[in-house]
């Protein structure tokens, strides 16, 4: 905190500018009008203040608006952005995308900060819905930012906003996100013909159940191995093999490299040897011949 | 994290010259300006020059049309030229960088270098 101290003659600031680098701490809390200073934020960031000083105005703003800082100045902190705490943007009410981006400039190429996350909590909770825009500004930002939410904060992901992720952006989803996401992506691209709506839906397919499943076995779509190790191990189970033969295509080759590994060792544990011995693949660990299969889940379901 | 280390300080006449040099590694992108602050015997520390990254220069009044800074941004590297030296310009001289992103945003500061100007 700098003490109160009269400004000395002629060194009062007329404008935010160069030769304030030059003022002790408490000359620049003496002689800067805060009113002036949060007018003229947008003139702050092309000068080269030490920290120290930014502290100074950042307590003269916090003076001036004990509430939150108006939008107004906000969009213009640029650095002094770095200095901010999460409390201190908890007041604050971001309506404007670009004042989003503007601030997500000050962290770029770098990990989200406390900050940062606060921030954009707020802009989406004011928003009141992941809007395509604003998915689409933080997903360049930060191409985690969609698995880092929860299952309850992606279901107010508005289908219409599907079309802003990448593959990338799903990178780090688990299933329980994927579950949530799969749903909307499937809505977001139904009236895509077979091939195009194949590569759209394939990174969310993590999140697909069996009937979805069974269904793109019937249009040649090529699966490959990565995507078919993603799927859900209780979606993959009821699958025939001829149903994962017609979903992987020539990929169906893969499936030996993976038969020690989740859902494919899972799945083989409950095919007939005899029908996994079709694909030539040498795969092991089926049903032996003449075994019956029970269904017990069935049996529980009609009883 | 980012280090500085200055180079260049020693005794000099008045009316003589010398040329400090800082040299910044380690984290050293995202630095937006570097600068040269003293700090003479009784006083406390001042600034004397600043440049940005952009290479816009600002020079105290005591300074101004002796000293010079310039930057080699390639090198990381910020230098003072003084001439014209004078007593009153005697102090332990300081070099400074301010990183303006995360993970590391803030001011950095060298050991220092001793100016002493006497006849």
């Known amino acids: 905190e700098v003490e109160k101290t009269a400004c000395p003659s002629g060194k009062k600031a007329p404008e935010i500018d160069e030769s304030l680098i030059f003022y002790k701490k408490w000359e620049l809390e003496a002689c800067v009008d805060a009113a002036l200073l949060a007018t003229q934020m947008d003139r702050v960031n092309a000068i080269p203040f030490t920290y120290e000083q930014l502290d100074v105005l950042k307590h003269k703003l916090d003076e001036l608006y004990p509430q939150g800082y108006p939008e107004s100045v906000i969009q213009h902190l640029g650095y002094l952005f770095l200095k901010m705490s999460p409390e201190d943007i908890r007041k604050w009410n971001v309506t404007s995308l670009e004042t989003l981006k503007a601030l997500l400039e000050v962290n770029k190429g770098h990990e989200m900060s406390p900050q940062v996350a606060t921030l954009i909590d707020r802009f989406v909770k004011g928003r009141g819905q992941l809007d395509k825009d604003t998915l689409d500004t933080l997903t360049a930002f930060y191409p985690g930012y969609l698995c880092s939410l929860s299952p309850e904060e992606l279901s107010s992901v508005p289908p219409s906003s599907i079309w802003a992720v990448r593959p990338q952006d799903l990178d780090t989803c688990d299933p329980r996100q994927l579950d949530v996401l799969y749903p909307k992506a499937r809505l977001a691209f139904q009236n895509m013909n077979g091939s195009e709506y194949f590569v759209k839906i394939q990174s969310f397919l993590g999140g697909a159940p069996t009937e979805d499943l069974k269904a793109l076995s019937q249009q040649n779509v090529s699966m490959d191995l990565a995507t078919f190790m993603k799927l859900r191990t209780d979606a993959v189970l009821p699958l025939t093999v001829a149903e994962v033969q017609k979903l992987l295509g020539p990929h169906v080759e893969g499936l030996k490299a993976e038969e020690r590994h989740r859902p494919v060792r899972d799945w083989i544990l409950r095919q007939r040897q005899d029908d996994l011995d079709t694909l030539g693949l040498g795969l092991q660990g089926g049903i032996p011949n003449g075994y019956l299969v029970l269904d017990l889940s069935m049996q529980e379901a009609l009883s | 994290q980012l280090q500085l280390v200055e180079s260049g300080g020693g005794l000099v006449q008045p009316g003589g010259s010398l040329r400090l040099s800082c040299a910044a590694s380690g984290s050293v992108n995202s630095i937006t300006a570097m600068g040269w602050y003293r700090q003479g015997p009784g006083n406390e520390r001042e600034l004397v020059a600043v440049i940005t990254d952009r290479g816009r220069a600002s020079y105290a009044d005591s300074v101004k049309g002796r000293f010079a800074i310039s930057m080699d941004n390639d090198k990381h590297t910020v230098y003072l030229q003084m001439d014209s030296l004078k007593p009153e310009d005697t102090a332990v001289y300081y070099c400074?960088?301010?990183?303006?992103?995360?993970?590391?945003?803030?001011?950095?500061w060298g050991q220092g270098t001793q100016v002493t100007v006497s006849s």
């Open positions: 400074n960088a301010h990183r303006r992103t995360w993970p590391h945003p803030g001011d950095y």
